[in-house]
């Protein structure tokens, strides 16, 4: 069944990083357009991306209202040029997305080392806190604001002159590590949510930053 000459969407997929959330689907439309609806389990359907010829819809504005809710979306197919009144009492064909819980499923974006500072044999490494589109009281929240202590960072560091890596962990955005005096070190960080048991538990590694370059500051004491 369904509206004449329209094909139901398929392969509905959530793509989400740091809560920026896009629903993607197939097929590329031929003589048809799409409208997306999104709902929470306790809410109701809201229409988005009306009569679009795209095969994606940015649903960030909806999911950031409550990132711990579970969302369901569906994509309706309409014949192009006949979206308002097809003269048919048939509902357009549609397909449901998988359920999506942003807090549990959004991917962690690649972190960035903001700075490092050496004081004697200690180095303080600071991870840049990424801003999200999640709001509280009209203020955008950082990744740390949203995840709190559920989010940790792992620091990988090694002497520039060798390949043996050491690791450190923090549930803040700062590390204080011991280093050998007179040695240059390189650093990379990774965001991790240990409570997750899925592939999206870890981010990709940050770009490598090495001492002796402009990001850091060294003070011999």
């Amino acid at each position: 069944s369904g509206t004449t000459n329209t094909v139901a969407a398929y392969n509905l997929t959530w793509k989400s990083t740091n809560f920026k959330t896009i629903l993607e689907w197939e097929p590329k439309p031929i003589n048809q357009v799409y409208t997306v609806q999104i709902s929470t389990k306790s809410g109701d359907w809201k229409s988005k991306c009306f009569y679009t010829a795209d095969t994606e819809c940015d649903l960030t504005d909806e999911i950031v209202k409550d990132v711990k809710q579970t969302y369901l979306a569906r994509v309706f197919s309409y014949p192009a040029g006949h979206v308002e009144s097809t003269g048919s009492t048939e509902e357009p064909p549609y397909e449901n997305s998988p359920e999506f819980t942003p807090y549990l499923e959004t991917n962690l974006g690649q972190p960035t080392i903001q700075s490092f500072e050496q004081v004697g044999t200690k180095v303080n490494v600071t991870v840049q806190d990424e801003w999200t589109l999640v709001r509280r009281n009209d203020t955008f929240l950082s990744l740390r604001d949203v995840f709190g202590k559920d989010l940790i960072y792992t620091l990988y560091y090694w002497k520039s002159s060798s390949s043996g890596k050491k690791t450190a962990k923090t549930n803040t955005n700062e590390f204080l590590i011991d280093v050998d005096k007179g040695e240059n070190y390189c650093f990379s960080v990774q965001a991790v949510i240990p409570s997750r048991r899925t592939a999206n538990r870890k981010s990709t590694d940050s770009p490598v930053e090495c001492m002796g370059h402009e990001k850091g500051e060294s003070r011999e004491i």
Epitope: S42, D44, K65
Partner: antibody, heavy 118, light 107 residues
Framework: QVQLVQSGAEVKQPGASVKVSCKAS????????MHWVRQAPGQGLEWMGM????????TYAQKFQGRVTLTVDTSTSTAYMELSSLRSEDTAVYYC???????????WGQGTLVTVSS | DIQETQSPSSLSASVGDRVTITCRAS??????LNWYQQKPGKAPKLLIY???RLQSGVPSRFSGSGSGTDYTLTISSLQPEDFATYYC?????????FGQGTKVEIK
Amino acid sequence: QVQLVQSGAEVKQPGASVKVSCKASGYTFTTYWMHWVRQAPGQGLEWMGMIDPSDSYTTYAQKFQGRVTLTVDTSTSTAYMELSSLRSEDTAVYYCARGSGPGLFAYWGQGTLVTVSS
Amino acid sequence: DIQETQSPSSLSASVGDRVTITCRASQDIRNYLNWYQQKPGKAPKLLIYHTSRLQSGVPSRFSGSGSGTDYTLTISSLQPEDFATYYCQQGNMPPYTFGQGTKVEIK
């Protein structure tokens, strides 16, 4: 416990407007949608529309589009349904109902009888 | 819009009887089918949601089944307090629509 308390009965002239209120308590008002359903005397139930109190997003049944306006006042946890250009066939009991999922009306107000008569 | 056709429109039964009410939708509503009970002068009360899930506090003699376009409400052993009007309602797609109702009367 969840409670929806509606305003009292109204008698209106044809062509007038009526505004029915629904005060919610016992839950976080902005978390759940509010629906409005009416029932003419001796007749069945008819869905009029719904509103998301978190952002005032509304969806109306086409039959009522342009005549019904749903609003909320989050400071008092109150939903409102205003119906304009009243005619005799709008005589009905009007219910607010709290949503608990897509198209699901788990809690209902006691109803407000609106009588349209000249 | 999706239409619901309920049958029968009324029925007479005795206490202890097994009662079945059916609801047919004009198209597949993917199990988004709810049942309500209404007594005279009162607001409707949710009994069953999503075809077969019993609302909290509703006696287990009420049950629901079905799929696609055809759905059923069953009262396994009718009790005196069950004499009322029953409505099915599709929650698959706005505008949400109700069946015309089934009045269950005492035989």
